[in-house]
């Protein structure tokens, strides 16, 4: 039925065909909303409502609490407090919005249908209170290219959520865009494992996401990026790691990401980018890097990055980058720094420095007193040393004697501790 999605079947008589044409023109039909065009149409034409309800259901009907447009190949089940994925999704659906619901768990084959949803290309599940996505949740969706799971507290994301199987190399996923912004669960709901590790395991399982071009992982409190994650996503064009807590990129390699066009690292806790990272970024042919709102530490370790910033064209808004630390450098524009500005003073605050100086003086005094005591008692110490030496000599002579007897094969029957 091109153009509209109705909850009723095709009708034989002319009046129903007319009504159906009206539905096509209206484009959007809601199965539930009393204010929607479909409902008002029904209320003004009671004959249509009674005739439709008498017919068997259409294979491409619109699920309860959803809005459908066959013309746009779109189904929207938005803010409906759904607790599970509707079973009666129309086969034509290309864009499915299931946002703002209460799905909680996405089981294996959550979208598996007979016939399959072969056209489904974009699936948005953001803000649907999902806390568990099980292995194979997105299986039997051969055309799924965009998946958005943002704003769900994913305490349990199966390693095989996207790959669908636990094989070491599984069938390639059709996914091209994976949006996982703000999926970190509250602290008390996290499993006893690294959240970063859980997400990365799902991204790497079975090497299924080799074709992924966009990956968004913003706002997830990531403290680090596991070193192998990017190497196994070679097709990436856009990577968003903004608004995390990344302190360093030292162990992250961008070398393999030759297609990478944008790298968002704004709003992290980056202090400096080291030579290795700078060289890798500079080596990416199409890259644009975003580094705003990081607490850059402008000391001697920053020199290479400042030199690079002055020369590179890859950093967007590089003129806006400013120092956070040390205090004397706060708010300084990075691009205006020179090597003379970038020293490594002792990072101890003056109060601590004073304490350590005082401690040093006290220890020196104690050492001096100890040496003085030793000097004043040198005769007694000398005598004591002689006594020790004599005692040791007597003891060692006895030891050597016993050792020689024990080593004699003719005396093996004698007890080693017997008096000889």
């Amino acid at each position: 039925m091109p153009g509209g999605c109705s909850r009723g079947p095709a009708a034989g008589d002319g009046r129903l065909r007319l009504a159906r044409l009206a539905l096509v023109l209206l484009g959007w039909v809601s199965s539930s909303s009393p204010t929607s065009s479909a409902s008002s149409f029904s209320s003004s034409a009671p004959f249509l409502a009674s005739a439709v309800s008498a017919q068997p259901p259409l294979p491409d009907q619109c699920p309860a609490l959803c809005e459908c447009s066959e013309a746009a190949r779109t189904v929207k089940c938005v803010n409906r407090n759904l607790t599970e994925v509707p079973t009666d999704l129309p086969a034509y659906v290309r864009n499915l919005f299931l946002t703002g619901n209460q799905l909680a768990v996405l089981p294996a084959g959550a979208f598996a249908r007979r016939p399959p949803l072969a056209e489904l290309a974009a699936l948005n599940l953001s803000g649907s209170r999902l806390d568990e996505v099980r292995a194979g949740a997105f299986e039997h969706l051969p055309s799924l290219r965009q998946l958005d799971l943002s704003h769900n507290p994913l305490a349990d994301l199966s390693p095989f959520a996207f790959s669908g199987s636990n094989a070491s190399v599984s069938a390639p996923s059709p996914l091209v865009e994976l949006i996982l912004n703000h999926i970190v669960p509250p602290e008390d709901e996290r499993q006893n494992r690294s959240f970063e590790g859980m997400v990365v395991a799902a991204l790497l399982a079975g090497r299924a996401l080799q074709g992924l071009r966009r990956l968004e992982l913003a706002s997830n409190h990531f403290l680090y990026l596991p070193r192998d994650v990017l190497a196994q996503l070679p097709s990436l064009r856009h990577l968003d790691l903004s608004n995390n807590s990344l302190v360093s990129l030292t162990y992250v390699s961008f070398r393999n990401l030759t297609h990478l066009e944008s790298l968002h690292l704004e709003d992290n806790a980056l202090k400096v980018l080291h030579n290795g990272t700078l060289a890798e970024l500079q080596g990416l042919p199409h890259i644009r890097v975003f580094l705003d709102n990081n607490p850059w530490v402008c000391d001697c370790h920053m020199a290479d990055m400042v030199t690079w910033l002055k020369e590179t064209e890859v950093v967007q808004g590089k003129d806006r980058l400013t120092c956070a630390y040390p205090e004397k450098m706060r708010n300084r524009v990075l691009l205006e720094l020179n090597s003379a500005d970038l020293d490594c003073d002792p990072i101890l605050p003056p109060s601590l420095q004073t304490s350590y100086v005082f401690l040093g003086i006290v220890l020196a005094l104690i050492g001096a007193i100890f040496l003085l005591v030793l000097y004043l008692n040198r005769k007694g110490i000398k005598k004591w040393m002689h006594n020790i030496r004599d005692a040791c000599r007597d003891h060692m002579e006895g030891y050597h004697y016993r050792y020689e007897i024990n080593a004699d094969p003719r005396l093996t029957n004698l007890s080693s501790n017997s008096d000889v």
Epitope: D319, R330, L335
Partner: antibody
Framework: QVQLQQSRPELVKPGASVKMSCKAS????????ISWVKQRTGQGLEWIGE????????YYNEKFKGRATLTADKSSSTAYMQLSSLTSEDSAVYFC??????????WGQGTTLTVSS | QIVLTQSPAIMSASLGERVTLTCTAS???????LHWYQQKPGSSPKLWIY???NLASGVPARFSGSGSGTSYSLTISSMEAEDAATYYC?????????FGAGTKLELK
Amino acid sequence: QVQLQQSRPELVKPGASVKMSCKASGYTFTDYVISWVKQRTGQGLEWIGEIYPGSNSIYYNEKFKGRATLTADKSSSTAYMQLSSLTSEDSAVYFCAMGGNYGFDYWGQGTTLTVSS
Amino acid sequence: QIVLTQSPAIMSASLGERVTLTCTASSSVNSNYLHWYQQKPGSSPKLWIYSTSNLASGVPARFSGSGSGTSYSLTISSMEAEDAATYYCHQYHRSPLTFGAGTKLELK
């Protein structure tokens, strides 16, 4: 010590333009961003825009884009703001401030602009 | 844009009283970029607390700041006469940069 010295009060007619200045001393002018902030009598503070004197990069509040023009002269360590098509709503004290992401550490004394026919 | 809402708008406090001023953001602000300014009539604003909790140079230790996300506060442990002023919170996180409408702190 760091100082931001702003130009004298201005009395202008509606529809006219005005250009005020902010002379920086006590630090290297190009090392820090200069922001401009508006405060109407008895009101709060409103950010107009900012200029990075070293690179001459400028960022505006959309609300003032097209009417405010920020410039900087490195040789005299002076930042300027020109406001055009003035109305009575533009009557306010305009501050320049030196700082950035981590707060505006130093402020000028303000330039009072009165728009009246 | 991020709207900063300060409360109360006006507050009276006695000498020695503990005072807390709040600033609520319409969306999350990184605590590194949330600042407080003090302004007295006829004067320019002065940076008072930067990056949520760091006292600017010359600010008495009775002042403190805290908060994260969308909720921030400035606290005076023991009110003194010289603390009477208007206090503005300010975010330098998202453009356009914005200020709260201010809290006027008066001596009771």
